[in-house]
């Protein structure tokens, strides 16, 4: 069964800067990746970035840099100040779509006990949705 993992890290050098990394563990080609915060993409969350494997990347503040790391994983750097700044308990969600086969989404947040800049290796997060 395909799975999605999400890793959230706060940068030690800039405490208002977060890095979100997401990956898809499964076979099949990914047609779109959507990163959101405040909840899942289809349940009131706000889209931060969308990445298409061939047509490019779109992103919205406070997203600073979204990129593909591999064919099945992405990273997103967030940089905020004031109202648009993420906080330590913000939930980030990643949705990997493979049209028309289905989509898989998982969410994560900064580990409560982690120090800035330190993070455990990514582990598969529970699948919230599979069409």
């Amino acid at each position: 069964t395909p799975e999605v993992w999400v890793q959230v890290r706060m940068e030690a050098t800039e405490l208002s800067s977060f890095t979100i990394r997401c990956g898809f563990l499964g076979s099949g080609s990914i047609s779109l990746v959507t990163v959101s915060w405040g909840g899942p993409n289809g349940a009131g969350g706000t889209t931060l970035a969308v990445l298409h494997p061939e047509r490019g990347i779109r992103q919205w503040a406070p997203a600073r840099q979204a990129r593909w790391e591999t064919q099945s994983s992405i990273s997103l750097i967030l940089e905020g100040s004031g109202a648009s700044s993420p906080c330590a308990n913000t939930t980030f969600c990643c949705k990997f779509a493979s049209f028309p086969e289905g989509s898989w989404e998982a969410c994560g947040s900064l580990p409560p006990s982690s120090d800035p800049g330190l993070s455990a290796p990514p582990t598969p997060a529970p699948i919230l949705r599979a069409d």
Epitope: N41, T47, R55
Partner: nanobody, 121 residues
Amino acid sequence: EVQLVESGGGLVQPGGSLRLSCAASGYTSRTDCMGWFRQAPGKEHEGVAHIDSDGIPRYVDSVKGRFTISQDHAKNSLYLQMNSLRAEDTAVYYCVVGFKFDEDYCAPNDWGQGTMVTVSS
């Protein structure tokens, strides 16, 4: 959660017409296009038509002049009027909500289960 439910598919003779409907509910922030994709048996899927957030309809060349896409915002519905149908229009048609990456492409973020259109005599 976003829900898209298509209806209106079926068997039609060449030259005939069908109207597909898509009932939409739920919410995805920042999506800026809604449209129809299709996948013929054994073939790659293709975008048939979509409407931008500015209301401009766009069509793949093979359906221009034959298909018309429209929206009813009050009913949260999308439609595809298909006229002068041909055998090569046979496919599963999917209603999609997505993101624009260029003028002619709406990348699907959410889609329905699909409705089968068969054009045959």
